[in-house]
């Protein structure tokens, strides 16, 4: 019957994805048992995305590669609500690369996934960005103003945040 074949397909997909993410945490979305949305374990989920805090210290380029190998990218922050969710999982004494860079050093900031850079939805610390040679963005904590963004040199190793769309099976 229909439900049986759907379950068989779902198990097949789960097995296939296990080679990339050994464990997935899935939830039924809405009332329809057909729709399962999954995030790799132990990634966290918010709205339609999954997030992973990488504690290894790497350059921006290596951090982005690390995310992309997993089917993700360095995080693109689209709303204040999304940033508020992300910071719940960060450590105050650490800095984390975002998927935001200025490759030409001309203050043309661009998100790694080509999301248009919107000045009205940015969370720079006061006085930032402040150096044309600092072409990559991090999020960090400053006691005076809590969590915000700062521009830094891309080669300086930092922790990072990966983001991917939820996996639907």
């Amino acid at each position: 019957n229909f439900m049986y074949s759907k379950t068989v397909k779902r198990l097949s997909k789960l097995r296939e994805y296990q080679q990339y993410h050994p464990s997935l945490t899935c939830v039924m979305e809405g009332k329809d048992i057909e729709d399962w949305s999954c995030c790799p374990t132990p990634w966290t989920s918010f709205q339609s995305s999954c997030y992973f805090i990488s504690t290894g210290m790497q350059s921006w380029t290596k951090s982005q590669k690390n995310c992309s190998v997993m089917g993700a990218d360095l995080v693109v922050i689209n709303t204040r609500e999304e940033q508020d969710f992300i910071i719940q999982n960060l450590k105050r004494n650490s800095s984390y690369f975002l998927g935001l860079s200025d490759p030409g050093g001309r203050r043309h900031w661009q998100w790694v996934d080509q999301t248009p850079y919107n000045e009205n939805v940015t969370f720079w610390h006061s006085g930032e960005p402040n150096n044309l040679d600092e072409r990559c963005a991090i999020i960090n904590f400053r006691s005076s103003e809590e969590w915000g963004w700062n521009d830094i040199h891309c080669h300086v190793p930092q922790k990072s945040i990966c983001k991917m769309k939820k996996i639907y099976i």
């Epitope: 296939e16 994805y17 080679q19 990339y20 380029t61 982005q64 590669k65 992309s68 190998v69 997993m70 089917g71 990218d73 790694v112 996934d113 080509q114 991917m164 769309k165 996996i167 639907y168």
Partner: nanobody
């Protein structure tokens, strides 16, 4: 680790055609979105074309639209770039790239989003 190998490059006249192939070692090739990029002398690596995991969605840089076609054969672990009406400005080393993707429609058009790259194949178009 996904291994990619391009082939099919060569020296042709303006107006001629070539078909590039890129074969992947990964047995679950159908879970990888693919792209073609090119690197011309003295320039930076530029996006040419991209294709989704299912092959149902494609995208091209404006300068090759209507002339180039990207396609894939998941049974053969291969992605193709059919290049027609070639121009001298198409001269470059062409690279294919792969990225794990769990959707059937997403496309990736920037180099940092691809972790896996081939060694490249030279295409030279003489006038």
């Amino acid at each position: 680790q996904v291994q990619l190998q391009e082939s099919g490059g060569g020296l042709v006249q303006a107006g001629d055609s070539l078909r590039l192939s890129c074969t992947a070692s990964e047995r679950t090739f159908s879970n990888y979105a693919m792209g073609w990029f090119r690197l011309a002398p003295g320039k930076e690596r530029k996006f040419v074309a991209a294709i989704s995991t299912s092959g149902g969605t494609t995208d091209y840089v404006d300068s090759v639209k209507g002339r180039f076609t990207i396609s894939r054969d998941n049974a053969k672990n291969t992605v193709y770039l059919q290049m027609n009406s070639l121009k001298p400005e198409d001269t470059a080393v062409y690279y294919c790239a792969a990225r794990l993707d769990f959707s059937s429609t997403d496309l990736y058009t920037t180099a940092p989003r691809y972790p896996y790259w081939g060694q490249g194949t030279q295409v030279t178009v003489s006038s």
